[in-house]
């Protein structure tokens, strides 16, 4: 039971981490213009990964898109490769964990294929919450640097007669919908990987017996070998006696076919 | 076809109070920004006072902050200006105008004017 | 504030004239964001409130002729009237539609 609810509530909290990272990715507000200590403008700027937009005190919106590959900064181009590697591997995280979900039945599927897919699911959150993270922070450091050398120098004029205001940016809304959103795909990819290892099955090399002895029943049960997810802790041989009453460790791992108690 | 019909102008007192109202007709007034926009008697132009469509934000003159207050109720698509403790300075012509949504912020429609007399 | 500048403060002109006026800022009305200037031209005759003749320092409000040009970018701009009617004596103003508070040029009286 706990076992399906740490993988079901790991593929939520990826479908949302998610479903975050594709708005973050697809938000106009990466970076928004700075209004602290600024002349106030009539007009707001406002930049996001595929196209940059103004906001005018009339209401009307205009937004252009970047029309150009060569033309963009690596580090646009960076940022863009990192969260739709990120949007990619947690799609297909999503795809695999559905058929991994242990409250799903696929045909006659074992338990180590379902312990397996939830495994490679959660590798690909991980993998997909650190790719968005790691997109957002790279934008933010940009954003950081641009922020200090046009706060350095402000007002470029002529002769210190005319002024030209250097429009400054700052984090936009984007950049928290992406780390949270990248966080939560983190979690959630952690949570898949802490389910699989209770849904890896206790494989043995040969069938347990029963032993039943004239004064109180002794279960004999060995343990022999774990299924190679390398996850197992339980790899002693263990004998249960009062009627089938289990060692603490035991009742971490969950029973298999084999076991007659 | 936009209208903009200003009313409540009038001679105040120094220090008197005057409420302006723009009755606007011929579009959709809660979605535009609408401005109050003066016209002292030497005929320079100068901007009062600007609410934003939609957001209601508002945006103020330094030689009027604190004295007037701009406000709008869309129910009635009337526009309002309230004016206290007035001084001999304010005496003009107040335009309401409003703000073209394609016009990069520019009016593209003015009102008739209602004046405005600040004298003892 | 913004200062707006304008020059002459008054011209006599000709019937069928060209006539040139200028508009400067104090500080640009260059928006980096989308490449657009925000400074729009006010034509006011006697009586009349002003009417919208050009905005974005050089694109013609609806029913405009065409005689009226605007250009310029970040600080200077020029509004220009390529042969003058006798109904275009009126004062003409520039505005910055960019920083707050919006300002006005003192405006350019043409007359006969």
């Known amino acids: 039971m706990a076992v399906t609810a740490c993988q079901g509530l790991g593929f939520v909290v990826s479908l949302i981490g998610i479903a975050g990272i594709i708005a973050a990715t697809c938000m106009d507000q990466w970076s928004t213009q700075d209004l602290y200590n600024n002349p106030v403008t009539a007009v707001f700027n406002y930049q996001g990964l595929w196209r940059s937009c103004v906001r005018e005190s009339s209401g009307f919106t205009e937004c252009r898109g970047y029309f150009t590959l060569l033309g963009l900064p690596a580090m646009l181009q960076a940022v863009r490769a990192l969260m739709i590697v990120g949007i990619v591997l947690g799609a297909i995280g999503l795809l695999v964990s559905i058929f991994a979900l242990k409250c799903i039945r696929i045909g006659s599927m074992e338990d180590s294929a379902k312990a397996n897919m939830t495994l490679t699911s959660g590798i690909m959150f991980i993998v997909s919450g650190l790719c968005a993270i790691a997109g957002v922070s790279v934008f933010a450091n940009m954003l950081v640097t641009n922020f200090w050398m046009s706060t350095a120098n402000m007002y470029t004029g002529m002769g210190g007669m005319v002024q030209t205001v250097q429009t400054r940016y700052t984090f936009g809304a984007a950049l928290f919908v992406g780390w949270v959103a990248g966080g939560l795909t983190l979690i959630g990819g952690v949570m898949m990987c802490i389910a699989c290892r209770g849904l890896a099955p206790e494989e043995t090399n040969y069938k347990a017996v029963s032993y039943h002895a004239s004064g109180h029943s002794v279960a004999y049960k060995p343990g022999g070998f774990k299924a190679s997810t390398g996850f197992g802790s339980n790899t002693k041989n263990k004998k249960i006696y009062d009627g089938g009453a289990r060692t603490e460790d035991e009742v971490q791992s969950y029973p298999s076919k084999h076991d007659y108690v | 076809e936009v209208m903009l019909v200003e009313s409540g102008g009038g001679l105040v007192k120094p220090g008197g109070s005057l409420k302006l109202s723009c009755v606007a007709s011929?579009?959709?007034?809660?979605?535009?920004?609408m401005s109050w926009v003066r016209q002292t008697p030497e005929k320079r132009l100068e901007w009062v006072a600007t609410i934003i469509g939609g957001y209601g934000n508002t945006y103020y003159s330094d030689s009027v902050k604190g004295r007037i207050t701009i406000s709008r109720d869309s129910a009635k698509n009337t526009l309002y200006l309230q004016m206290i403790s007035l001084r001999s300075e304010d005496t003009a012509l107040y335009y309401c105008?409003?703000?073209?949504?394609?016009?990069?912020?520019?009016?593209?429609?003015w009102g008739q004017g209602t004046s405005v007399t600040v004298s003892s | 504030d913004i200062l707006m500048t304008q020059s002459p403060s008054s011209l006599s002109v000709s019937a069928g004239e060209k006539v040139t006026m200028n508009c400067k800022s104090s500080q640009s009305l260059l928006n980096s964001g989308n490449q657009k200037n925000y400074l729009a031209w006010y034509q006011q005759k006697p009586g009349q409130p002003p009417k919208l003749l050009i905005y974005?320092?050089?694109t013609r409000e609806s029913g405009v002729p065409d005689r009226f040009t605007g250009s310029g970018s970040g600080t200077d701009f020029t509004l220009t009237i390529s042969s003058v009617q006798a109904e275009d004596l009126a004062v003409y103003y520039c505005q910055n539609d960019y920083y707050y508070p919006f300002t006005f040029g003192a405006g350019t009286k043409l007359e006969l």
């Open positions: 974005g320092a050089s």
């Open positions: 105008t409003r703000l073209g949504q394609t016009q990069r912020n520019a009016m593209d429609y």
């Open positions: 011929g579009f959709t007034f809660s979605s535009y920004t």
